[in-house]
């Protein structure tokens, strides 16, 4: 049984990135928390001309943005997963 | 290989117009901002602003805004900056300067135009 | 506007030697900044963006750090091919602004 559950074990991003992107260039972005499937926190980032990065969730300047969503968001109650376009 | 090839130098005279382009080849030109940048003789670099090929969408530094008009040309992959009311402040190099899309510097640089402004 | 400023605009270094130069932002730019080389005569050369990390084919003998505030560049071996005027860049917000330059001296 134990087999068979971790073969659903669904990670998206095979490779994370540190490189800061400044936010007039990121489109969306999607913070998946650990569960769903993936035993990692996993934040993945549209950029404005449709290309995807994953990106280190201990980035500073990621957990910036993530800061500043959640103050967004703070009205709303949470959710597990969440995609938020950057304004 | 990516490069940026700049028109030549002008002279003009105080009050004058000038057209300088940046004509682009061993990429996608249309995928890819252009920046220009300004370096004065006293060697410090200002960004004047950006364009987007793709839907022809300008980001101007406020200082510029009344100086330059950013466009480009899809068909021959060439963007354009004018630079209008010129005066002896205006002298300069200006480079035209891609901006790389996995880390937001700017990549490849054009070899610049020198611009001198004169009676 | 977002300032850059770097205190030295002359540095002056021996072949071998281990030079660091500094770079200082008005406000708070994370690790929004890039560093440039600019030779006599050329255009200027990215060398490092993202604060920290080295552009592809740049000798490993150029490192960088910083965030937020503070940035420092450093050459851990100068060779005689590093004479040449060094910028910050910051890319954290528009518009984009630079540092007013290190020109590097070979002794």
């Known amino acids: 049984v134990l087999e068979v559950y971790y073969t659903h074990l669904r990670c998206r991003c095979v490779q994370e990135s540190s490189v800061f992107i400044p936010r007039r260039f990121i489109d969306r972005i999607q913070i998946s928390p650990r569960g769903n499937g993936c035993p990692r926190k996993e934040i993945i980032v549209w950029k404005k001309n449709k290309s995807v990065v994953c990106v280190d969730p201990q980035a500073e300047w990621i957990q910036r943005i993530m800061e500043m969503l959640r103050k967004k968001s703070s009205s709303t109650p949470p959710v597990p997963v969440f995609k938020r376009k950057i304004p | 290989e990516v490069q940026l090839q700049q028109s030549g130098p002008e002279l003009v005279k105080p009050g004058a117009s000038v057209k300088i382009s940046c004509q682009a080849s061993?990429?996608?030109?249309?995928?890819?901002?252009m920046n220009w940048v300004k370096q004065s003789h006293g060697k410090r670099l200002e960004w004047i602003g950006d364009?987007?090929?793709?839907?022809?969408?300008?980001t101007y530094n406020q200082k510029f805004k009344d100086k330059a008009t950013l466009t480009v040309d899809k068909s021959s992959s060439t963007a354009y900056m004018d630079l209008r009311s010129l005066t002896s402040e205006d002298s300069a190099v200006y480079y035209c300067?891609?901006?790389?899309?996995?880390?937001?510097?700017?990549?490849?640089w054009g070899q610049g135009t020198s611009v001198t402004v004169s009676s | 506007d977002i300032v850059m400023t770097q205190s030295h605009k002359f540095m002056s270094t021996s072949v071998g030697d281990r030079v660091s130069i500094t770079c200082k932002a008005s406000?708070?730019?994370?690790?929004?900044v890039a560093w440039y080389q600019q030779k006599p005569g050329q255009s200027p050369k990215v060398l490092i963006y993202?604060?920290?990390h080295r552009h592809t084919g740049v000798p490993d003998r150029f490192t960088a750090s910083g965030s937020g505030t503070d940035f420092t560049f450093t050459i851990s071996s100068v060779q005689a091919e590093d004479l040449a005027v060094y910028y910050c860049?910051?890319?954290?917000?528009?518009?984009?602004?630079f540092g007013g330059g290190t020109k590097l001296e070979i002794k």
């Open positions: 993202s604060a920290s």
């Open positions: 860049q910051q890319y954290y917000n528009t518009p984009w602004t």
């Open positions: 364009i987007n090929p793709n839907n022809d969408g300008t």
């Open positions: 300067a891609r901006l790389s899309w996995s880390f937001f510097a700017m990549d490849y």
């Open positions: 406000q708070d730019v994370s690790s929004g």
């Open positions: 061993g990429y996608a030109f249309s995928d890819y901002y």
